[in-house]
């Protein structure tokens, strides 16, 4: 059976928009008016992993762009990081671990926890123009609240 | 073409229980995954469980967990949804769904569905 896939946006609970930054970089920061067209549209997949009521697997591509988000150990710690993939094959319902996210739904907020790394999270800091990174607190400085926005194909 | 025909509905009493049927053609049964939303009178459409297309993951709304069970017979292509317990709320159409992924909450996609069969818990 074919993959799903929806495309997206997401923003950070302070509002911050994700953008590119260099060829394998997502920063986070605010946009307004005709530069929000600069924000990346997400291809979300949802692919096979543990699902709950509130747990849901999902892979994060590029729209159009042979890039996913992926988690890996870079010196000893969980990175977040844009990887290339042979768009022959990808996305797929059966997506390596380092791919998959659990899309978590609480209280209309998303949280994308790493199923690689449990307990890690995609998340972006407080201060303007700083890289979107993989973190491993909640509740602390750095933001993992995310909210979502369809976009029409 | 995709035909997707629900039976087994009808009207039963508080408690009571009903098995509806998903006979299933037109397209690779054991390729997907499969599922039930239903709609109350009046109401938007619920999502109520899934079933993964190797039938060894199954996924409940909170409102039926405990009291319903969804499964499948590659061999007949066919999907079921045993529901135990029934309640008043319980009362809708219910409709099997192709290739029916959950996006959170409140949203599904899904590529066909069937006609629906009519559930009435009264008594």
């Known amino acids: 059976a074919p993959v799903r896939s929806l495309n997206c946006t997401l923003r950070d609970s302070q509002q911050k928009s994700l953008v590119m930054s260099g060829p394998y970089e997502l920063k986070a920061l605010h946009l307004q008016g005709q530069d929000m067209e600069q924000q990346v549209v997400f291809s979300m997949s949802f692919v096979q992993g543990e699902e709950s009521n509130d747990k849901i697997p999902v892979a994060l591509g590029l729209k159009e762009k042979n890039l996913y988000l992926s988690c890996v150990l870079k010196d000893d710690k969980p990175t977040l990081q844009l990887e290339s993939v042979d768009p022959k094959n990808y996305p797929k319902k059966k997506m390596e671990k380092r791919f998959v996210f659990n899309k978590i739904e609480i209280n209309n907020k998303l949280e994308f926890e790493s199923a690689q790394f449990p307990n890690w999270y995609i998340s972006t800091s407080q201060a303007e123009n700083m890289p979107v990174f993989l973190g491993g607190t909640k509740g602390g400085q750095d933001i993992t609240d995310f909210t979502m926005q369809f976009v029409s194909s | 073409e995709v035909q997707l025909l629900e039976s087994g509905g009808g009207l039963v009493q508080p408690g009571g229980s009903l098995r509806l049927s998903c006979a299933a053609s037109?397209?690779?049964?054991?390729?997907?995954?499969m599922g039930w939303v239903r709609q109350a009178p009046g109401k938007g459409l619920e999502w109520v469980s899934s079933?993964?297309?190797?039938?060894?993951?199954?996924y409940y709304a909170d409102s039926v967990k405990g009291r319903f069970t969804i499964s499948r017979d590659d061999s007949k292509n066919t999907l079921y949804l045993q529901m135990n317990s029934l309640r008043a709320e319980d009362t809708a159409v219910y409709y099997c769904a192709e290739n029916l992924v959950r996006v959170d909450r409140r949203r599904w996609m899904f590529d066909y569905w069937g006609q629906g069969t009519l559930v009435t818990v009264s008594s």
């Open positions: 037109g397209f690779t049964f054991e390729d997907y995954q």
């Open positions: 079933i993964s297309a190797m039938g060894n993951r199954t």
